[in-house]
């Protein structure tokens, strides 16, 4: 189920790379966030809580990522034109239940000024 395009700035460019921001409600305690490029899973991050409220962060498809209390940022480096595509944040909520999946995304446009190694 595609819930629509992100209603926030999803792509932040810096130093020839891009930070892709995937937001979730700050009351979500346990979840899996996947970054999809088209239909392909590029990255994922799973946050779970164990006994004693110990937090576990796991990734099956690892990218450089950063977790905050209401977002996961995935970082892509060495941008080139092949990175231009639709990117989706696929959020699976485990806690609080009932289980829910939501998909938001947008198109990543690549301009010459954002490439990592421009020809002078």
């Amino acid at each position: 189920e595609i819930n629509g395009s992100a209603n926030y700035e999803m792509f932040i460019f810096h130093n020839g790379g891009v930070q892709i921001l995937c937001k979730y409600p700050d009351i979500v305690q346990q979840f899996k966030m996947q970054l999809l490029k088209g239909g392909q899973i590029l990255c994922d991050l799973t946050k779970t809580k164990g006994s004693g409220n110990t937090v576990s962060i796991k990734s099956l498809k690892f990218c450089h990522s950063q977790l905050s209390n209401n977002s996961v940022s995935f970082f892509l480096y060495n941008l080139d034109h092949s990175h231009a595509n639709y990117y989706f944040c696929n959020l699976s909520i485990f806690d609080p239940p009932p289980f829910k999946v939501t998909l938001t995304g947008g198109y990543l446009h690549i301009y010459e000024s954002q490439l990592c190694c421009q020809l002078k």
């Epitope: 819930n3 409600p25 009351i27 609080p96 239940p97 009932p98 289980f99 829910k100 939501t102």
Partner: antibody, heavy 117, light 107 residues
Framework: QITLKESGPTLVKPTQTLTLTCTFS??????????VGWIRQPPGKALEWLAF???????RYSPSLKSRLTITKDTSKNQVVLTMTNMDPVDTATYYC?????????WGQGTLVTVSS | DIQMTQSPSSLSASVGDRVTITCRAS??????LAWYQQKPEKAPKSLIY???SLQSGVPSRFSGSGSGTDFTLTISSLQPEDFATYYC?????????FGGGTKVEIK
């Protein structure tokens, strides 16, 4: 501080459509609030869940009432609206809206709706 | 749908008594159960979530236990303000369902 308040008609006639509005404060349905639900309680009876709307506009309904219910939200106004068609005297109840983070942690005061001709 | 069955439907107790209310789910719901207190003409108030976690501001005489299908709400020493109706609710899956309620009355 999270607060919710229901508003709407206190009396509706059979076959009419009921429209209830939940106006809330203390959270945003944009990102930080998981969602808002509606629950009703006929006089002297138990609580019954009706509908729920998530921050991303995903909607869930009680299967037994799904054909009669519509839930919508207006994030900019901090409001959630429930409409219920083809009202019947058995729908006489106090209708509550509530903020949900799994369980319903904050409730409105409720509004009594009587269905009578 | 998951049916929630509360027992007893009503009970009489005195101030200082230990009171236990049970709630049974028709299928396993892990620990995704909440308890609410409702006084006449008032909205329900959240007491317990995740079967045993005390909602902020709720007195410690209230406690919850259980997982799977069988759950218990205990009031360790009943106070005058605790005379009310108590409801359980599962939030493991849709449709969300409530128990039929337990009315705690003064003996």
């Amino acid at each position: 501080q999270i607060t919710l308040k229901e508003s709407g008609p206190t009396l509706v006639k059979p076959t009419q459509t009921l429209t209830l509005t939940c106006t809330f404060s203390g959270f945003s349905l944009g990102t930080s609030g998981l969602g808002v639900g509606w629950i009703r309680q006929p006089p002297g009876k138990a609580l019954e869940w009706l509908a729920f709307i998530y921050w991303d506009d995903d909607k869930r309904y009680s299967p037994s009432l799904k054909s009669r219910l519509t839930i919508t939200k207006d994030t900019s106004k901090n409001q959630v609206v429930l409409t219920m068609t083809n009202m019947d005297p058995v729908d006489t109840a106090t209708y509550y809206c509530a903020h949900r983070r799994g369980f319903f942690d904050y409730w409105g005061q409720g509004t009594l709706v009587t269905v009578s001709s | 749908d998951i049916q929630m069955t509360q027992s007893p439907s009503s009970l009489s107790a005195s101030v200082g008594d230990r009171v236990t209310i049970t709630c049974r789910a028709s299928q396993g719901i892990s620990s995704w159960l909440a308890w609410y207190q409702q006084k006449p003409e008032k909205a329900p108030k959240s007491l317990i979530y995740a079967a045993s976690s005390l909602q902020s501001g709720v007195p410690s005489r209230f406690s919850g236990s259980g997982s799977g299908t069988d759950f218990t709400l205990t009031i360790s020493s009943l106070q005058p303000e605790d005379f009310a109706t108590y409801y359980c609710q599962q939030y493991n899956s849709y449709p969300l369902t409530f128990g039929g309620g337990t009315k705690v009355e003064i003996k």
